[in-house]
């Protein structure tokens, strides 16, 4: 083209529809110039115009040749230029924003505006960047791109964003602009212009506010607060924290917290500070629920379901901040609510739900909820297999005769489809605890009954019962102990008896021991005792308890004598013994020696014994008739461990062992013992009978039996020279080589003579007397030999 | 057991001057936050003054501003008010409270002492 | 500076009656810092909540706090006579620090 010719023809479209070329006019024309634009391909179309643009319909693909001619006063000049699709540029129409609001409660802006897509009849694809700026110097803080599609018709466009910073500390700015991407256009794609300027600011009602206020908050995240004030702000603070300042538009200040702490209950305080003022707000940094743990349904009663789980961790959130739990069952639709302020443990929270009618499974979802988000567990259960039934109450205890009794008690509940397996524990007093378990059917009422046999008459009784469903979940809690004593019965036995002929052999004295209480069934009142012979029996007065002895003149005659134990029910079977004792000349007096607590006695087992056997024993050093215990043992045994509270070491008993054979007691043995054998108390008396020039002659004691303390087995005699009241040493001090020592076995010797010795010269005699239990003291003496003749 | 007693009240012709005193026991004086409250006769509570615990910062109603001037000693665990050029409308029984919390800086008052009375008149 | 209303000025009940005590702040606070006080002819005030609806040391159960933003309530639920007295709402979450011009419960 020439020079002074029209240039720079450039051609847009914002529709692909309508395309609007614009050139340059030729330099030096005046106003008043006309063109003639011709667009020539096939075909030749010329237009007649007084602009320096035209808009004509799209074209299709292909070059086309454009001339425009340029007619003014001064002559005309032509330009020619190829026009392609390539050539032309898409720019989209300046986007409108139709409204912009905002949520100053959650500091989120919302954008509105029109695609105006009515005018694009191509489908295509635009993007949106959306451009946010914060305070009046227009700082960028968001630009962000946001697609939609042109499909013919307006379409309305929604947007939001939530702010870092409060939207009340600045003032908050946005524009949008686009840009159509169409696959079909081979023209240039560009950006629009940006959308008129739309603004949010905060009208405040009240001098001077701190933002967010009440806010909850992730623990670990960052947040915003400013101060919206007049006044110059000094200073920030978080708790105890100085915070820099951020200088927002005129004294409005923020704050930025990163990685934020988790708060006490009553929350974190954040204060702003100016020099007549201070403003404060609070921010409560938690947790979400955690998912509810360890969630369990079970009922006490079969009318209410309680839920209980562990909340896990603690949100640190409380009062209307708390975590609220709706605990939703899926077959029924039904639901209840939990709401409370946390307490900081990780107590167990629980539900109460109604059971409903005819409804056994029952599937349970907990929803847990805060300001920070929300968590679910969920349970499927059959309630019938999770009973835990209440404690049982009115635990009664009732006789049903001495050995039998009714136990009672309240379980509250619907149970009229189920069972109960209930465990009584059963306690006698000094004894081992018996647990007795008991299938009974529920019931409607609440109240329940059982009979529990096999007891004891006359027994103090400790009973508590608990109870579990058959298809076992969980025991009840014990219920209250109850004592009971049952009623007495007859005594089973009849009393353990002896007899003993008194020392001038006149009269019988017949022993008896009381019943143990398993026998005597009840308070022993009183006892019977009768002597019969073939002729005759005659009964002694009754003999109230505790006597436990009788005497009775009789001949040497046979005579049964019975002893009957009496209670308040009854009388015992009669404890029979006879008078006679068959005599036995082969006696010899043994010794035995205990262990330390008893004494092992045996014999040889003899047919002939036909009854049983028993060993008598008392303290030999006591008077007769000596009588101090006695044990029955069957007449099948051969041995027999004798013990008693009653036995001390070194004391000398009396043992008898008496056989019964038709009624009679013959003594098999007789034995002098000891439990356990002690050194002798004290040395035996001697006396030097006589002295030559080379002997002494010793003569001693008997020990008394009561100062031996054991079996006498021998004496230790020491001699060896030695003056009274000297230096010299003694007999018996350590290292003397002299010193001769005679031991004497032999526990008849009563003397001895000493030889060899030296005339006129001084010797010291020791004497010690022996047990198997120890060497007993000394007893010494000084004695001198005669001189040599 | 925590306790404030205030003293230094009496009567006082307007334009003069007062120091009120309290004594606070019982607790960590120099870790609590210490504000004065007045209450003029049969009327209600009107708060005067606060200063944090460490003394950083002091705070005034409108109504005493630049008049009053609130200090505390924390060795001697005592709180003043310097009051000057006394009005009237002044006239009141004046209170020392301790705020709740340790240490924070904005709380309520949990323990007051039993008041001093103020009267300004000719 | 932020004003505290409160209704009715008085408010006369029996004894085991229920009492509702209305606090209205002139603008919006933080529920964090409202308290509410009680006090009896010739004695300090004693605090009774704070932060709403947090009951302070030793203060019975009887005693309940509620609300947000600028409405808030102090409930007494069953009227001991020793709970005939002022009651006085406080906000501390902006100086200067102000008081409402109290409630009278008296014996009807």
């Known amino acids: 083209q020439k020079k002074g010719a029209p240039h720079d023809l450039k051609c847009v479209t914002n529709n692909l529809q309508v395309w609007n070329c614009s050139w340059k006019a030729p330099s030096g024309t005046g106003r008043g110039t006309d063109y003639e634009v011709c667009i020539e391909n096939r075909s030749r179309s010329c237009y007649q115009l007084e602009k320096t643009s035209i808009k004509i319909p799209a074209l299709s693909h292909g070059d086309y040749e454009i001339t425009i001619n340029s007619l003014h006063d001064f002559g005309s000049s032509t330009s020619k230029f190829t026009l392609n699709e390539q050539n032309v540029s898409l720019i989209p129409d300046t986007p409108e924003i139709l409204n912009l609001s905002a949520d100053f409660s959650t500091s989120t802006l919302y954008l509105k505006w029109n695609d105006r897509g009515s005018v694009f009849p191509h489908r295509s694809n635009v993007i949106w960047e959306i451009k946010v700026l914060r305070k009046e110097s227009m700082e960028l803080v968001k630009l962000v791109t946001h697609n939609t599609t042109l499909n013919g018709k307006d379409t309305l466009h929604h947007w939001s964003w939530a702010s870092d910073m409060p939207l009340e500390c600045a003032i908050h700015f946005v524009e949008i602009r686009c840009y159509i991407d169409n696959l079909h256009f081979s023209g240039l794609e560009e950006w629009s212009d940006w959308s008129p300027v739309k603004n949010i600011s905060w009208i405040p009602d009240s001098q001077t506010k701190v933002f967010p206020q009440d806010k909850v908050i992730l623990v670990g995240s960052d947040i915003t607060f400013c101060c919206v004030s007049q006044e110059k702000v000094l200073s920030a603070l978080i708790g105890h924290t100085n915070c820099p300042l951020i200088h927002l538009d005129g004294e409005n200040v923020a704050i930025k917290i990163r990685n934020i702490s988790v708060s006490a209950s009553s929350g974190t305080n954040v204060v702003f500070t100016t020099e007549d003022n201070i403003f404060g707000t609070v921010i409560f940094a938690g947790y979400p629920p955690d998912t509810p743990q360890q969630l369990n349904c079970e009922t006490h009663d079969l009318k209410e379901i309680i839920c209980s789980w562990n909340p896990g961790r603690v949100t640190a959130l409380v009062g209307p901040r708390a975590t609220s739990y709706t605990l939703v069952e899926s077959f029924s639709g039904k639901y209840v609510r939990l709401k409370r302020a946390e307490a900081p443990t990780n107590e167990s929270y629980q539900l109460l739900f109604q059971m409903l009618p005819n409804q056994e499974i029952y599937n349970f979802t907990l929803n847990a909820h805060n300001p920070l988000g929300r968590s679910q567990s969920t349970i499927l259960v059959n309630i019938t297999e999770k009973v835990y039934p209440h404690t049982p109450t009115s635990f009664k205890v009732k006789d049903i005769n001495s050995t039998a009794v009714k136990l009672s008690w309240h379980l509250p509940g619907n149970f009229a489809k189920i069972n109960f397996l209930c465990e009584i524990e059963i306690k006698k007093s000094n004894s081992v605890q018996e647990q007795r378990n008991v299938t009974i059917k529920g019931v409607e009422n609440s109240s329940y009954l059982v009979a529990l046999d096999k007891l004891n008459p006359y027994t103090l009784y400790t009973f508590r019962i608990r109870c579990s469903t058959e298809t076992f979940w969980k025991w009840s809690k014990w219920s209250n102990k109850k004592q009971h004593l049952t009623t007495e019965a007859s005594p089973s036995k009849g009393p353990d008896t002896w007899r003993e002929w008194s020392s001038d052999g006149k009269n019988l004295i017949i022993y008896w021991k009381p019943l143990p209480i398993n026998e005597a069934n009840g308070k022993i009142l009183s006892y019977n005792v009768s002597c019969s012979s073939d002729e005759e029996t005659q009964s002694l007065s009754e003999i109230p308890d505790p006597q436990h002895k009788a005497e009775i003149r009789l001949d040497k005659n046979d005579y049964i004598i019975s002893v009957v134990a009496k209670n308040s029910v009854g009388s015992s079977p009669p404890s029979k013994i006879a008078s006679m004792e068959i005599p036995n000349d082969d006696l010899k007096i043994e010794q035995v020696v205990g262990m330390g607590k008893g004494i092992l006695l045996t014999w040889h087992y003899d047919p002939n014994m036909t009854c049983d056997y028993v060993i008598k024993w008392c303290n030999s050093s006591r008077s007769e008739p000596c009588l101090m215990d006695w044990r029955k043992v069957p007449s099948n045994s051969t041995e027999t461990v004798i013990e008693s509270d009653e036995f001390r070491p070194g004391i000398r008993y009396n043992f008898f062992l008496y056989g019964c054979r038709n009624q009679g007691y013959q003594l098999l043995r007789s034995m002098i013992g000891y439990i356990e054998e002690l050194a002798p108390i004290v040395a035996p008396n001697f006396t030097v009978e006589d002295t030559s020039a080379d002997s002494i002659l010793v003569k001693w004691e008997d020990i008394p039996v009561e100062e031996l303390r054991g079996f006498l087995r021998g004496y230790l005699f020491y001699f060896g020279k030695g003056e009274r009241d000297t230096s010299k040493m003694r007999v018996l001090e350590s290292g003397r080589s002299d010193i001769k020592v005679k031991n004497i076995t032999d526990i008849s010797q009563k003397t001895l003579r000493i030889a060899d010795l030296q005339g006129k010269t001084s010797y010291h005699l020791v004497l010690r007397a022996y047990t198997d239990g120890g060497v007993g003291p000394e007893k010494s003496m000084y004695v001198v030999t005669k001189e040599n003749s | 057991q925590v306790q404030l007693v205030e003293s230094g009240g009496g009567v006082v012709q307007p334009g003069r001057s007062l120091r009120l005193s309290c004594a606070a026991s019982?607790?960590?004086?120099?870790?609590?936050?210490m504000d004065w409250v007045r209450q003029a006769p049969g009327k209600g509570l009107e708060w005067v003054a606060v200063?944090?615990?460490?003394?950083?910062?002091?705070y005034y109603a409108d109504s005493v501003k630049g008049r009053f001037t609130i200090s505390r000693d924390n060795s001697k665990n005592t709180l003043y008010l310097q009051m000057n050029s006394l009005r009237a409308e002044d006239t009141a029984v004046y209170y020392c409270a301790r705020e709740l919390w340790f240490g924070e800086l904005l709380s309520p008052f949990d323990f007051w002492g039993q008041g001093t009375l103020v009267t300004v008149s000719s | 500076k932020i004003v505290l209303t409160q209704s009715p000025g008085t408010l006369s009940l029996s004894p085991g009656g229920r009492a509702t005590l209305s606090c209205r702040a002139s603008q919006s606070i933080s529920s964090s810092y409202l308290a509410w006080y009680q006090q009896k002819p010739g004695q300090a005030p004693r605090l009774l909540i704070y932060a709403a609806s947090n009951r302070a040391t030793g203060i019975p159960d009887r005693f309940s706090g509620s609300g947000s933003g600028t409405d808030f309530t102090l409930t007494i639920s069953r009227l001991e006579p020793e709970d005939f007295a002022v009651y006085y709402c406080?906000?501390?979450?902006?100086?200067?620090?102000?008081f409402g011009p109290g409630i009278k419960v008296d014996i009807k």
């Open positions: 019982g607790f960590t004086f120099s870790s609590y936050g």
């Open positions: 200063i944090w615990y460490d003394g950083s910062n002091k």
């Open positions: 406080q906000q501390y979450g902006s100086s200067p620090f102000t």
